[in-house]
């Protein structure tokens, strides 16, 4: 068998909401993956498990099952969303994310994803992890790959 390549492309969008009373931030983060099948037969993408960490703490998890199949020598782009919560011992982040004196409220999140594929009863797992900048101060849509290389040197308001 030839390889199945998984490439984490980056954050596609991040939608933010707050609970003022609980000083809690809710971030719905949609990520994009490219999965390439280099074989001459179809493979099933059985599941994708993902988690997001902030400051070494897991703030969100997601699992997608029975996602799709990828034909021979084909590639599919898959979006998956991880709901995250920044709260409790990290509630100081509420102050940062809602600070009106700054324009862009970029925080650094560790994105971890594991893709499980199957073919002819054989199962294979491929994992990737990547640090990404996400704006916790407003709803943001990113161009593919932009969130990894964000120039965080934003001018002051």
């Amino acid at each position: 068998p030839r390889s199945i390549d998984v490439k984490y492309i980056g954050v596609k969008s991040a939608y933010v909401s707050y609970d003022v009373q609980k000083r809690t931030i809710y971030l719905n983060i949609t990520n994009t993956l490219n999965i390439t099948n280099n074989n001459y037969y179809s493979v099933e993408v059985e599941n994708i498990t993902a988690q997001v960490q902030f400051a070494k703490t897991v703030i969100g998890k997601a699992r997608l099952n029975n996602i799709t199949h990828i034909g021979p020598l084909d590639m599919k782009q898959i979006d998956y969303t991880v709901p995250t919560v920044i709260a409790e011992e990290m509630s100081y982040m509420y102050d940062f994310c809602t600070l009106i004196s700054i324009k862009v409220h970029n925080i650094v999140l560790m994105m971890q994803v594991t893709v499980t594929t199957t073919y002819f009863g054989h199962s294979e797992q491929i994992s990737q992890e990547r640090y990404q900048y996400v704006d916790c101060g407003r709803n943001t849509t990113y161009q593919l790959g932009q969130s990894e290389y964000l120039n965080v040197l934003q001018p002051q308001q």
């Epitope: 000083r23 509630s91 102050d95 940062f96 970029n106 650094v108 640090y131 040197l153």
Partner: antibody, heavy 117, light 107 residues
Framework: QVQLQQSGAELVKPGASVKMSCKAS????????IEWMKQSHGKGLEWIGN????????KYNEKFKGKATLTVDKSSSTVYLDLSRLTSDDSAVYYC??????????WGQGTSVTVSS | DIQMTQSPASLSVSVGETVTITCRAS??????LGWYQQKQGESPQLLVF???NLADGVPSRFSGSGSGTQYSLKINSLQSEDFGTYYC?????????FGGGTRLEIK
């Protein structure tokens, strides 16, 4: 307004211990970690450790493990730094500061510790 | 531990000039960097947090920039009250460490 009020200067003998305090006011005490730094005379800053009042999580710089102990009195919103087995190397100004994302935004006025026989 | 190399160690400049202080981290610190000013006999004061954001009450002549391992603090049109020692500090992974400081002296 946010304030971190530290206890007064200490003159202590070698081998003794000292306990200094950092009283927080003007914000919800359990929300932000409190950091501690050491600044020897005319020198730079060293991070000793931090204490998060939300869950009592304490982290230390390896260099200060066994030397520094952080404790809290939540009823008075006060974090304490205890330094043991003092030597002349421990003579310094000790600062507490409030952690914020990407920087320490409020600092105490410092506590000067002089170790001398 | 992440090492922070700050330069220059000292500089002497005239009022009205522009100054840039740099800080290099021994590994990527993902913009988790603060800049502080300390005057003789006083506590450090936060100038810039998360690499680029000006702290409350800090004059707009101060600005922070950088990413990855390279960061800088720029002071435009230096004022006499800007003398003192400047420190960078990373807050990426414990232990937080500070740069060695830059002593800014007014000519």
């Amino acid at each position: 307004q946010v304030q971190l009020q530290q206890s007064g200067a200490e003159l202590v003998k070698p081998g003794a211990s000292v306990k200094m305090s950092c009283k927080a006011s003007g914000y919800t005490f359990t929300t932000f970690p409190i950091e501690w730094m050491k600044q020897s005379h005319g020198k730079g800053l060293e991070w000793i450790g931090n204490f998060h009042p939300y869950n009592d999580d304490t982290k230390y710089n390896e260099k200060f493990k066994g030397k520094a102990t952080l404790t809290v009195d939540k009823s008075s919103s006060t974090v304490y730094l205890d330094l043991s087995r003092l030597t002349s190397d421990d003579s310094a100004v000790y600062y507490c500061a409030r952690y914020f994302y990407g920087g320490m935004d409020y600092w105490g006025q410092g506590t000067s510790v002089t170790v001398s026989s | 531990d992440i090492q922070m190399t700050q330069s220059p160690a000292s500089l002497s400049v005239s009022v009205g000039e522009t100054v840039t202080i740099t800080c290099r981290a021994s590994e990527n610190i993902y913009s988790s960097l603060g800049w502080y000013q300390q005057k003789q006999g006083e506590s450090p004061q936060l100038l810039v947090f998360a690499a680029t954001n000006l702290a409350d009450g800090v004059p707009s002549r101060f600005s922070g920039s950088g990413s990855g391992t390279q960061y800088s603090l720029k002071i435009n049109s230096l004022q006499s009250e800007d003398f003192g020692t400047y420190y960078c500090q990373h807050l990426w992974s414990i232990p937080w460490t500070f740069g060695g400081g830059t002593r800014l002296e007014i000519k």
